[in-house]
Structures are given as structure tokens and as C-alpha cells.
Amino acid sequence: GSGIFQLRLQEFVNQRGMLANGQSCEPGCRTFFRICLKHFQATFSEGPCTFGNVSTPVLGTNSFVVRDKNSGSGRNPLQLPFNFTWPGTFSLNIQAWHTPGDDLRPETSPGNSLISQIIIQGSLAVGKIWRTDEQNDTLTRLSYSYRVICSDNYYGESCSRLCKKRDDHFGHYECQPDGSLSCLPGWTGKYCDQPICLSGCHEQNGYCSKPDECICRPGWQGRLCNECIPHNGCRHGTCSIPWQCACDEGWGGLFCDQDLNYCTHHSPCKNGSTCSNSGPKGYTCTCLPGYTGEHCELGLSKCASNPCRNGGSCKDQENSYHCLCPPGYYGQHCEHSTLTCADSPCFNGGSCRERNQGSSYACECPPNFTGSNCEKKVDRCTSNPCANGGQCQNRGPSRTCRCRPGFTGTHCELHISDCARSPCAHGGTCHDLENGPVCTCPAGFSGRRCEVRITHDACASGPCFNGATCYTGLSPNNFVCNCPYGFVGSRCEFPVGLPPSFPWVA
């Protein structure tokens, strides 16, 4: 504790200028005071002034009023500081002395004589109010007042409570009259060292180091730290928990980097060809006749479609072609004949039927042959009947379509769910994508089909506490604990309310 006993001398009266021994002062009593403050004694005794003592310079002669003075010699009120817990009781001895010597340091002069003394014993509480008193004896009268106040930074009934206002790393507060702390705006806690975060700042995902701040723990973002950050490698996805990559519409794959609508987004197929969202690049172009190339960007020879009939030979020209017809035929495509049935024009066992009164003919072809003279073996694949990149194969009188994985039907027109074959091992979840199935593996397994057993499964040891859910990340030795409400920490091991310096991603 620490405080000050203050004594204000107001007036001293010694009209006759007499000393305590009955002698008079010559030329007058040049008066100074000695004050002794000590612990309470029922009967005041000589001995050390346990609470302190002080002397004044000469304040006047015989009778005088003592003015207040704040500094220098002759300071009034007199200050008796103490550095202990104020007990609430005291004994005070005030002596008036005459000195023939130095005004400023009368204590040191020889021949000092006592004029009078008073003794006060009693109780006194700490407070700002002065207690006023007056003491008389036969020759003198002294008016005075006194009080006990606490030193700076000390508070309470006995000045025993230390409180120093501060605004730094160790606390942000002012002191109440009783010495208790009064936190500055934005701070809380026993020592006002905990900032009050931005209103609404998420209890688990956010924290602050100064008031009205909301700093997010790893994996969270936004003003209130209530929105997650997708995985580092994520391209076209969002998240509902940190580091997730949930694909936007039209995107697939682990990092949502496979365009499931490549045809719509990029229109890669040229020259009126048909685009399908399939194939190793995410799309396949089916060309119109006369075009080829991955994007149908290459124009074929004009003769490539075999436009000349009846054995005519085709010659490419700049923007067209020309048919050179064999004997007996004419027309742009050698489609007209000068022959009759008498010329036996039908090949491969075709039967000839006369038309236009015998001036022309028509051949009826046996199975597997075609053409106006049954000269062509039927190729049932010329019409590109197989969809979705299926391969057409001639099988005698018929043809079959050999379908790509994931397709079925006579013309490969039906899409099989890739997941129907249950390609994911060890209980993996299958997702149908245009480029094939994608497996989401359970904890402890990895690989394209969840076929690889991970030797170290981060979740296997049950690292998450308090009912938290464990997720393995993209690396087998990384895990995430998703804490239930009321818990925080990398393993959800801390109840909310502990210092918020624990992230929850292990």
C-alpha cells in the first residue's frame, strides 16, 4: 500500500508570546512546528515516529495564520507519506517551538524552546474530506485539519490496491475509484487484455488481436470468417468446408478442371460437324462427308465421295469434279445408259428389266450388291451408322457397330452408366463423368479406382475429439477435423473460450 497523511496548519495563537516553561520570548516567539505520526497508542509515549515525522521552517511570530503553499520550504499542507497498508488508526503529536536561529532550518539551531504541544489519537478512514479540529491550552490555540489520501495508482480503503492505467500489450484499462479495472472500449477479460472481435466474427473460424477485427483461421475467409476457401488446385469449383473442390455446373474431375460441356463452351468442331462431349480430350467431332481431321477442319478431295456411277472415273477440278463415263453411259455422274438388256449390262447375277419400250433398262441386284449395274458390293458402313465414336464393321450381309466403352445399342446410341459396372473398389463412391467414371475413395484407399491401400490412413487412429468428423485430404498423411459447435482446435480438443490461437486443420 501507499498513501499520504496530510496536515493543514491554519492558525496559531500565542498572544502573550510565552514558552511552555512560563518564560516569554524576546522579542517574540519565532514559531516552527514538529509533527510526529505513529501507530495508535492509547497513551502517547516518546519513541520513534513509526508513521513518519516532519518539521516546518519558521511560519510566524507569536500569533499568525498559515497560508497554503504547494512547493518549496514552508509547504502547507504538510505531507507524511507512508508505504504500507493504512490501518485506519493513528497517533499524532504536534509541537510548536521557538527558535532564536535560522528561519529556514530551525531544527538545527541550538537553544530551541518548546511553546506547546497537542496529541491526537483516533481513527481515520482514507478519503478526500478534511477533518477540521482546534486545540487550546492556557496560553495557545492551534486550528488545523487533516486527512489520509492514497498515492497515485493506489486505491481502496487502506490504499493497498495498486492500479496503474495502461493501454499496451498487457492490458487496456483505466482505474475505478475502488481500484478495480475499467476496460477501455473494445477490450474485455480480467486484465482487459482480450480484444472484442468484430460483431458476428465466427467463434471457431475467426479470432482477433485488436478490437473490431476478425482474422480468419486457415481455410476460412470473408468479413466474419464464415466462408470457406476451396482447395489450392481447384479450378472451377467451390466449397462447403475448407479445401474442398465441389465442381461448378459443367465441370468435373478432382480439381474441377475437366470441361463437361466443352462443345458448348469452345465449339471446336468445324465445317458443320457434330460435337459430342466425350473422348479423351473431352469432345469428339463427327465430320460431314467431304471433311476430315480432329476438328473436321480438313476438306477432302471432291472425288472422295465417289460421285461417278457406272464405273465412271472422277477428275478433281478447282471447285468441282468431272466424271469420265465408260462406253454406253452419259450424264454428269454417268447415271444415264445407252445400253439395253440385250447388252447384258447387269453384273453379279443381277436381272435386267427393260424400260421405256426397250430404250433403257434397270438392274435388280441380288443381296450384297448395289449400283445401277449391280457392280458394287454393298458397304453398309458408308452411312456412318455408328454413333458416339463406334466402329462400323461389315459382317456378310449385315453390319455391326463396335461401341466405345460406356455405350451400347445397335448403333451405340445408348449411354451406359460407367458406374453400373461398379468400378470403384473398397466401397468407393462412383461419379459418372463424360470422360469416364471418377471414384471418391473412403479413408485408407486411393488410386483411380480406390484399388491402392494407403498404409498410413491419417483418420484411422481417430485423431479427432468431441465427436468431430475426420476427413483425409489429398495427401494420406493430412487430415481435417470438422469440429461440432462448441469445440475448436486442430483436433477439436478445446472447448470454445480458450485462447483462440489454435487452427483446426491438422
Partner: antibody, heavy 118, light 107 residues
Framework: EVQLVESGGGLVQPGGSLRLSCAAS????????MAWVRQAPGKGLEWVAT????????YYRDSVKGRFTISRDNAKNSLYLQMNSLRAEDTAVYYC???????????WGQGTLVTVSS | DIQMTQSPSSLSASVGDRVTITCRAS??????LAWYQQKPGKSPKLLIF???NLADGVPSRFSGSGSGTDSTLTISSLQPEDFATYFC?????????FGQGTKLEIK
């Protein structure tokens, strides 16, 4: 392919201003928080500012607070850094990066040089 | 702010060598640490995140380990293209801070 292309750097006098831009492609820009990171010549990397993807919350390193402003335009797939009251110590290559202050910076632009000198 | 101290600041090695770079944080960063590679005149490239996770497209000769305040980047068999400067970065505490860098040179 993720691409971040910065522009707007150059020579400016102390006290002057510059506006850096970053054009993003190859990912859904509006889904991701973005940042600016700088590197003084021959020195290490220093985070400058961050903006969230959701509500546009911004954070700055103490030495640029009140002078720099980070912003984004999701419709244009663009990130910006308005730099005012430039000082000699702001001289650096400024990189646009995908990430927040509490996540790794997964993708970086090629950088744009800002020189503050009289 | 958390201080990140890398060691060594530079080192010389030969193709095929095994190389280790360490990074020490001034306080626990709970595995929230990344490693970047930067070649002269180029931008940094993310190699490793969360102390030990390999970023997409990074060769498996790179690996990370550590916990608490100490982390390590290891290159199991140096290739000619690995000579560069490497930086560590913590993203556990605000603001994020980087190490001063380690320059890996050809011996």
C-alpha cells in the same frame, strides 16, 4: 491453364500514384480469394494485400494501410491495386497471386515492376 | 508478426545430390506452411503446402516434413532444373510471412 497477367507498373516519383491490374483466366475467378505479393530487387517476398472472394473483405500489411487499395471486378475477371503516396521503399516487382492471407498462394502472375524514384 | 528463418541462406550441390533446406518459425504454426521455388526473372511456384502435401504437377523428388516450429524441404535427387531460390511461408497467423530464401547453386 490458370493464367494471371499483371500490368500497370512503371516509374513514378515519390508521392505519386499507380494502378496495377491483373487479368485472370483458366479458373472461376469469383470463387477464389486473391492477393498482391511484392519482391524488392534482390530481396525476399512480402505479402501486401488480400481480398476475399465472397464479400470483398480486404486486409493490408501495416506499411501500406491507408495508401493502397485492393479491389476486384468479378465480371471482368480482374484484380486491382491502387497505390497512392508512393515511397522509395515501395519499389518492387508486384505479383498478383491466387490465395488469402491464411492459405498458400497457389498461382502467381509474371509480375510487374514498380519503381519509385525522383 | 511471426519470423521465418531459413537455413542455409545459400548452398552448392551437384546433380543427383540429396538436399535439405530448413525453415524455423518464431512460434508454432501448426503445419500451415508452404514452400515455393523461384528461378531468376520468374515468379514463384508453389511446391508444397500444409508442410507435406505436394502441389499439383510437382515432381515426387520434392517432399516436405516437420511440425510445430521446424519444417524441412527435401529434394531426393537434384535435377538440373532444380537450381533456384526456395522460400518458405507460414499462413497460420496474420499477417502471412516468408523466409528470407535459400539459393541453391550448382557446385
Amino acid at each position: 491453364e490458370v493464367q494471371l497477367v499483371e500490368s500497370g507498373g512503371g516509374l513514378v516519383q515519390p508521392g505519386g500514384s499507380l494502378r496495377l491490374s491483373c487479368a485472370a483466366s483458366g479458373f472461376t475467378f469469383s470463387n477464389f480469394p486473391m492477393a498482391w505479393v511484392r519482391q524488392a530487387p534482390g530481396k525476399g517476398l512480402e505479402w501486401v494485400a488480400t481480398i476475399s472472394s465472397s464479400d470483398g473483405t480486404t486486409y493490408y500489411r501495416d506499411s501500406v494501410k491507408g495508401r493502397f487499395t485492393i479491389s476486384r471486378d468479378n465480371a471482368k475477371n480482374s484484380l486491382y491495386l491502387q497505390m497512392n503516396s508512393l515511397r522509395a521503399e515501395d519499389t518492387a516487382v508486384y505479383y498478383c497471386a491466387r490465395g488469402y492471407y491464411n492459405s498458400p498462394f497457389a498461382y502467381w502472375g509474371q509480375g510487374t515492376l514498380v519503381t519509385v524514384s525522383s | 508478426d511471426i519470423q521465418m528463418t531459413q537455413s542455409p541462406s545459400s548452398l552448392s550441390a551437384s546433380v543427383g545430390d540429396r538436399v535439405t533446406i530448413t525453415c524455423r518459425a518464431s512460434e508454432d504454426i501448426y503445419s500451415n506452411l508452404a514452400w515455393y521455388q523461384q528461378k531468376p526473372g520468374k515468379s514463384p511456384k508453389l511446391l508444397i503446402f500444409d508442410t507435406n502435401n505436394l502441389a499439383d504437377g510437382v515432381p515426387s523428388r520434392f517432399s516436405g516434413s516437420g511440425s510445430g516450429t521446424d519444417s524441412t524441404l527435401t529434394i531426393s535427387s537434384l535435377q538440373p532444373e532444380d537450381f533456384a531460390t526456395y522460400f518458405c511461408q507460414q499462413y497460420n497467423n496474420y499477417p502471412p510471412t516468408f523466409g528470407q530464401g535459400t539459393k541453391l547453386e550448382i557446385k
